[in-house]
């Protein structure tokens, strides 16, 4: 089996795999190299990737997207809470958890964001299998670099659920420098990974010299990216809807996501043109919406957005303790970062310095994630053979201690994979346990931090306050995810110690159980294309009939003619009041048709009228005849998934 | 599968000299860069020394002190170290293709 990197973007994602010394970024099916990420649900299949983005605007409300935002955070989070405003999905509560709720051929349906991620992750697996032309186990999946610890678990069990043995989680600007840093030989430099995505905004300062790549420091923002720029548009547009026609447009989700659309292509269009113009008919009760914008309107939209780029560029270089002056190169990625206005303050920013444009923004995150996954799978590249990554911990760990202070064991930016230890005891006489609250992030009290996990320590043995040792371990693993363990030190009965780890993580048995519905799923898939299959194989043939008949002319008998013709149209006529028919229902039709036309063609074949036959063209009949002889010489028919 | 073995660690007089051993398994050996690191109590895990194409690399703070050497025969990668001092007390990893050991504990005491 092959080992990929995958990308898991907000809005798109991305597959690639490394062998004979490169990289090879896969393109799906409908020959993108990057895949939306995107899953729709509806009354008879399940759609992901380009055909899932494609009939948003027709189904909003079972379109997933954004899952990226939603994994890995609690609903009460308030980005959740402010996301939910504008999503056209409904999404509930479930013990503290976002879910997303949809209708699925005639069901009322939730799925976590672990699930819907895993969907996508699937599409990228098979769309690496289709290329590779084997299976596809093993993969490193990528994140930002300042996901927490819950994003990144759930990140991880996303794959898990797709199928995948997801060896490492990899910070996507961590992934970025191996893209832009591979080929690199000679002295040290400081190179600063400049990450604007669909949703999410990441900065890394490396070091790069000899195959090592030192991840020195690490900022960002999880909720920010090319999404929240075509929000600003669309608010735009809304507003001058509204002056214009006085209607407000944001109460129909067709509307709005037909807007959102037409403002993502304004927005990359204003990246290489001065204005663009906006044309959507019939938006909203029938009116038609003509509007144009120019960049700097746009840039003005956003402004607050983009300048807001440069405060973790300033965390991470008073973080490393350099200067600006001392970074040798600037590598821009991720989509947004083809905007003009994002280029000049960061040129700015470095005194005029000019960015790197050596790695394609769009694939550079997929490119380094193939090359760690080859890596880690044992291949043995003279190119990757000289490589180490170093990479951080994004945000503190530490623990609560008395009068709520964060206690940090921790500190952000440590190089893992780490481990501290810690003693602790009880606070009274044979207490049976003891409570340890975990918590990540820079302020000085817990409530103002993200509290990751509560960690019971039962079955301590009877004793006086005080005397238990419990050595607990914080253990940072090179995915950037926290174990917690410990020992009894005192008596050694390590064993009697049960640590209840209360991450809010998915627990083994969901996710077997999603395991499990994933496997369902993609045999309904492949249920559903073959059934698809059998219907385009039918109306496919059946018009191609009608066709070859109409052109024989004289050679053959008008009855003959008439039947096949009358055979054919009674077929067309039945396919279209019988789309939603079963596999074996077209297959049975097929079987009627070519009962009927196939000992008719086999004339026609005899007078020399149909060479190559419609649809197969020998006399071994429809289908599985001769293979289809060029155009000229007569129709084809050609199969349709 | 990759297997990185750490051995040698113990207790040492400061001024002395260790010498630590990596049995390593499951990748071709002789193509691949060899790390050791280490992690001192309350502190972050620092790379010591490292040995790729290009011959070995040294942390400042163990220069002239430790030296880092492999057999390619043996699979085994080694890490000598003279004239140590308390702050060279650690747990000793040793790293390589992304893998890491179980570390073996340095103590320098008197």
């Known amino acids: 089996s092959k080992a990929v990197g995958i990308d898991l973007g907000t809005t798109y994602s991305c597959v690639a795999h490394f062998a004979n010394d490169r990289v090879d970024i896969i393109a799906n099916d409908q020959g993108n190299r990057t895949t939306p990420s995107f899953v729709a649900f509806t009354d008879t299949e399940r759609l992901i990737g380009d055909a899932a983005k494609n009939q948003a605007a027709m189904n909003p409300s079972n379109t997933v997207f954004d899952a990226k935002r939603l994994i890995g955070r609690n609903f009460n989070d308030p980005e959740v809470q402010a996301d939910m405003k504008h999503f056209p999905f409904k999404l509930i509560d479930v013990d503290g958890k976002p879910q997303i709720q949809v209708e699925f051929k005639g069901e009322t349906k939730n799925f976590t964001p672990e699930q819907i991620s895993s969907m996508v992750l699937g599409k990228m697996k098979e769309t690496a299998e289709s290329y590779l032309g084997a299976k596809v186990n093993d993969a490193v999946v990528t994140v930002p670099a300042y996901f927490n610890d819950s994003q990144r678990q759930a990140t991880k069990d996303a794959g898990t659920i797709a199928g995948l043995n997801v060896l490492r989680i990899i910070n996507e600007p961590t992934a970025a420098a191996i893209a832009y840093g591979l080929d690199k030989k000679g002295k040290e430099e400081h190179v600063l990974i400049f990450d604007l995505g669909g949703g999410t905004f990441d900065v890394s300062l490396l070091s790069i010299e000899d195959g090592i790549f030192e991840v020195k420091a690490t900022a960002g923002d999880t909720h920010l990216g090319g999404e929240d720029f075509d929000n600003r548009l669309v608010n735009h547009f809304i507003q001058e809807f509204k002056r214009k026609n006085k209607k407000d447009l944001s109460t129909n989700q067709r509307a709005l996501r037909r807007l959102r659309t037409a403002c993502e292509r304004a927005k990359r269009t204003l990246s290489s043109s001065a204005q663009t113009s906006v044309e959507i008919d019939s938006l909203f009760e029938g009116i038609d919406f003509y509007t144009s914008i120019t960049r700097a309107r746009f840039e003005e939209l956003c402004a607050d957005l983009f300048r807001s780029t440069l405060d973790p560029v300033e965390k991470v270089l008073r973080d490393a303790k350099l200067d600006k002056s001392q970074v040798d190169e600037i590598v821009l990625v991720g989509g947004s970062t083809r905007i003009p206005k994002v280029q000049k303050l960061v040129t700015d920013y470095f005194n005029g310095k000019e960015p790197n444009r050596s790695i394609n923004p769009d694939e550079a995150v997929a490119y380094g994630a193939a090359v760690q996954a080859a890596i880690l799978t044992g291949d043995e590249s003279s190119k990757t053979q000289d490589l180490l990554l170093l990479d951080v911990a994004p945000l503190s760990l530490g623990i609560e201690t008395a009068g709520g202070v964060m206690t940090k064991l921790i500190p952000r930016n440590s190089t893992i994979p780490t481990k501290k230890s810690e003693i602790f005891s009880t606070y009274a006489d044979n207490q049976p346990g003891v409570l340890i609250q975990v918590f990540e992030g820079e302020r000085a009290k817990t409530k103002d931090n993200n509290l990751l996990g509560k960690f019971e320590l039962s079955g301590i043995p009877p004793a006086p306050r005080g005397v238990p040792q419990i050595e607990v371990t914080f253990d940072v693993d090179s995915n950037g995810i926290l174990n917690v363990s410990a020992v009894e030190k005192g008596t050694g009965k390590s064993n009697k110690i049960t640590i209840t780890n209360d991450k809010g993580r998915l627990s083994k048995e969901d996710i077997e159980k999603m395991v499990a519905e994933a496997e369902k799923f993609k045999e309904e898939d492949e249920k559903e294309s073959q059934r698809i299959a059998s219907k385009n194989q039918l109306e496919s043939i059946a018009y191609s009939l009608k066709n070859t008949i109409s052109e024989a002319g004289d050679k053959l008998e008008q009855a003959d003619k008439d039947t096949v013709t009358k055979k054919a149209e009674e077929t067309i006529s039945w396919l279209d009041s019988n789309t939603t028919a079963s596999k074996e229902e077209f297959d049975d039709k097929l079987k009627e048709l070519q009962d009927i036309a196939n000992p008719i063609m086999s004339k026609l074949y005899q007078a020399g009228g149909a060479p190559g036959g419609a649809a197969g063209g020998a006399p071994g009949g429809f289908p599985g005849g001769a293979p289809p002889a060029p155009e000229a010489e007569g129709p084809t028919v050609e199969e349709v998934d | 599968q990759v297997q990185l073995v750490e051995s040698g660690g113990g207790l040492v007089q400061p001024g002395g000299s260790l010498r630590l051993s990596c049995a390593a398994s499951?990748?071709?050996?002789?193509?691949?860069?060899l790390n050791w690191h280490r992690q001192a109590p309350g502190k972050q895990r620092e790379l010591v020394a490292t040995?790729?194409?290009?011959?070995?690399r040294y942390a400042d703070s163990v220069k002239d002190r430790f030296t880092i050497s492999r057999d390619n025969e043996k699979n085994t990668v080694y890490l000598e170290m003279n004239s140590v001092k308390p702050e060279d007390t650690a747990v000793y990893y040793c790293?390589?293709?992304?893998?890491w050991g179980q570390g073996t504990q340095v103590t320098v005491s008197s």
């Open positions: 040995i790729g194409s290009n011959g070995p």
């Open positions: 499951g990748f071709d050996f002789s193509r691949n860069r």
């Open positions: 790293a390589a293709r992304g893998y």
